[in-house]
């Protein structure tokens, strides 16, 4: 084993090539220098290197930077990121969006990893706030990625940031956090006209509350039963028969389908059976005719 | 689309010589290690050779080590086999394969031909 | 490094669940894929780094595994399924293949 820890002879690497790749293990131990292999990282990309020798490549990079590497050379990891822990990446300082671009790329057609989900964190840490750019590259790799952030770091995301957001970045997010992006979506598209703000504004709107629904019912904006479906029940309960129906329009029979699942069916129980009538699509469940409705919540208010 | 179409397979004598030609298209070639796998009918697979993108660097299974011969041409998008002093042992079909490092970071293959038999028999 | 899959045949039903082992002679790490040979046909990649799927291949195949006790498994077999399966090895040069497993039907 001793004579194994000297290069044997004319076998010194000069450059990161494609000759090394039948090196045994200890021969990329013994031959390559780790400053050759910094400065030549981007080269590794192209060298089909097993596991073994990854793990050799990376051993040699951390006894060079102990403390975390560079960015020049993390920009240029390709696929020894694939080898990286969340403790080594937890080391870096990453500033740059073309190194993140360059490590999820990497990552492509993966879930996301630990070490993916670390190396976002330590970015968006680095910044102070998910801006617009970045948002747009997470989402681009992991259009789940907003959704998989709490509704404290949402907090953090600028209203301007929320033109990257596409309606499938949205579709795994609870109401809690939409009840965060919403209002930074009617900050965002506040200026543009009616048909074009609801379009943009149509897949925050589980986070909307009664009185922009109500406001929305006076638009003709014809929304569809999906959007309805994803309401926050306690926004809908409010509305009206003759509301529900102008924030539908010609999706107003889609209800009857829906009767039974909420919000749909929790609203069908808080209006008078005739108003409900008048829709003429056969739903049932509503107060009957005669009955007084005792708005509890606003007695407790006024006492 | 990806497509490796090999030829060239055959009946030969136990001694002789046969070169394998594969084609390769819907890819850039160049940018991918290329690899020559047999398997002996009703046996598993073996990977019987190895080359580069730029075809400077070369691997050779013991078996067939001073007498085959992988070589290609990335202006063709070709990868050949040169075969030589064949034994009846040599009698299998020989898939080319390509390297998937390039596309997923990791030394396996991810496309493949459908295999030339080359049948070693006197 | 040698890959040793067991068993070398089985013989199982539409429908069952299927599970074929591959065992390396030293440790991996997760350096592991799996192809599919059906008769006459060039292998198909199936999953690599032990348990990523390929894109295209149907959900019920999985794989598991690290170090040296690997495990390819179809949850509920299909008749296309029914075929040669193969485990590779791609931590350290020459790159190996076990010997096969044969999924024949009962």
């Known amino acids: 084993e001793v004579e194994k820890t000297a290069c044997p002879s004319g076998k010194k690497a000069r450059e990161i090539d494609e000759s090394l790749i039948f090196y045994k293990k200890w021969e990329l131990e013994a031959c390559v220098d780790a400053a050759l292999l910094a400065t030549q990282m981007d080269r590794v990309n192209a060298i089909p290197f097993t596991y073994e020798q990854l793990d050799v490549l990376k051993h040699k990079l951390d006894e060079l930077y102990p403390q975390g590497y560079p960015e020049s050379v993390i920009q240029h990891l390709g696929y020894l990121f694939l080898k990286m822990s969340p403790e080594d990446i937890r080391k870096w300082n990453v500033t740059s969006l073309e190194t993140l671009k360059a490590l999820l790329e990497v990552n492509k057609g993966h879930e996301m990893s630990p070490q993916v989900a670390t190396l976002i964190d330590r970015f968006v840490k680095g910044r102070g706030q998910l801006d617009k750019d970045t948002l747009d590259t997470l989402t681009a790799f992991y259009p789940g990625y907003l959704c998989s952030l709490s509704p404290e770091e949402l907090s953090s995301v600028p209203p301007s940031s929320i033109w990257a957001v596409r309606p499938q970045d949205l579709d795994t997010c609870d109401p809690r956090q939409l009840d965060v992006l919403y209002p930074k979506a009617r900050l965002a598209f506040q200026n543009m006209n009616g048909s074009e703000y609801f379009v943009k504004i149509q897949s925050f709107l589980g986070g909307a509350p009664t009185e922009d629904l109500k406001a929305l019912s006076q638009q003709n904006v014809s929304m569809d039963l999906a959007t309805f479906m994803k309401l926050r029940t306690d926004a809908v309960l409010p509305l009206t028969v003759a509301e529900v129906q102008k924030l539908l329009g010609p999706h107003v029979e889609g209800l009857k389908a829906e009767e039974r699942h909420r919000p749909v069916r929790d609203w069908i129980l808080r209006q008078r059976q005739d108003d409900l009538d008048t829709l003429g699509l056969g739903l049932q469940g509503g107060i009957p005719n005669g009955y007084l409705v005792l708005d509890l919540s606003m007695q407790e208010a006024l006492s | 689309q990806v497509q490796l179409v090999e030829s060239g397979g055959g009946l030969v004598k136990p001694g002789g010589s046969l070169r394998l030609s594969c084609a390769a298209s819907?890819?850039?070639?160049?940018?991918?290690?290329m690899s020559w796998i047999r398997q002996a009918p009703g046996k598993g697979l073996e990977w019987v050779s190895y080359?580069?993108?730029?075809?400077?660097?070369?691997y050779y299974a013991d078996s067939v080590k001073g007498r085959f011969t992988i070589s290609r041409d990335n202006a063709k998008n070709s990868l050949y086999l040169q075969m030589n002093s064949l034994r009846a042992e040599d009698t299998a079909v020989y898939y080319c394969?390509?390297?998937?490092?390039?596309?997923?970071?990791?030394?396996?293959?991810?496309?493949w031909g459908q295999g030339t038999m080359v049948t070693v028999s006197s | 490094i040698q890959l040793t899959q067991s068993p070398s045949s089985l013989s199982a039903s539409v429908g069952d669940r299927v599970t074929i082992t591959c065992r390396a002679s030293?440790?991996?790490?997760?350096?592991l894929a799996w192809y599919q040979q059906k008769p006459g046909k060039a292998p198909k990649l199936l999953i690599y780094?032990?348990?990523s799927l390929e894109s295209g291949v149907p959900s019920r195949f999985s794989g598991s595994g690290s170090g040296t006790d690997f495990t390819l498994t179809i949850s509920s077999l299909q008749p296309e399924d029914f075929a040669t399966y193969y485990c590779?090895?791609?931590?350290?040069?020459?790159?190996?293949f076990g010997g096969g497993t044969k999924v024949e039907i009962k």
């Open positions: 394969a390509r390297d998937g490092y390039r596309k997923y970071g990791y030394v396996f293959f991810d496309i």
């Open positions: 080359i580069s993108s730029s075809g400077s660097t070369i």
């Open positions: 590779q090895q791609f931590n350290s040069y020459p790159l190996t």
């Open positions: 030293q440790g991996i790490s997760s350096a």
């Open positions: 780094d032990a348990s």
């Open positions: 819907g890819f850039t070639f160049s940018d991918y290690y």
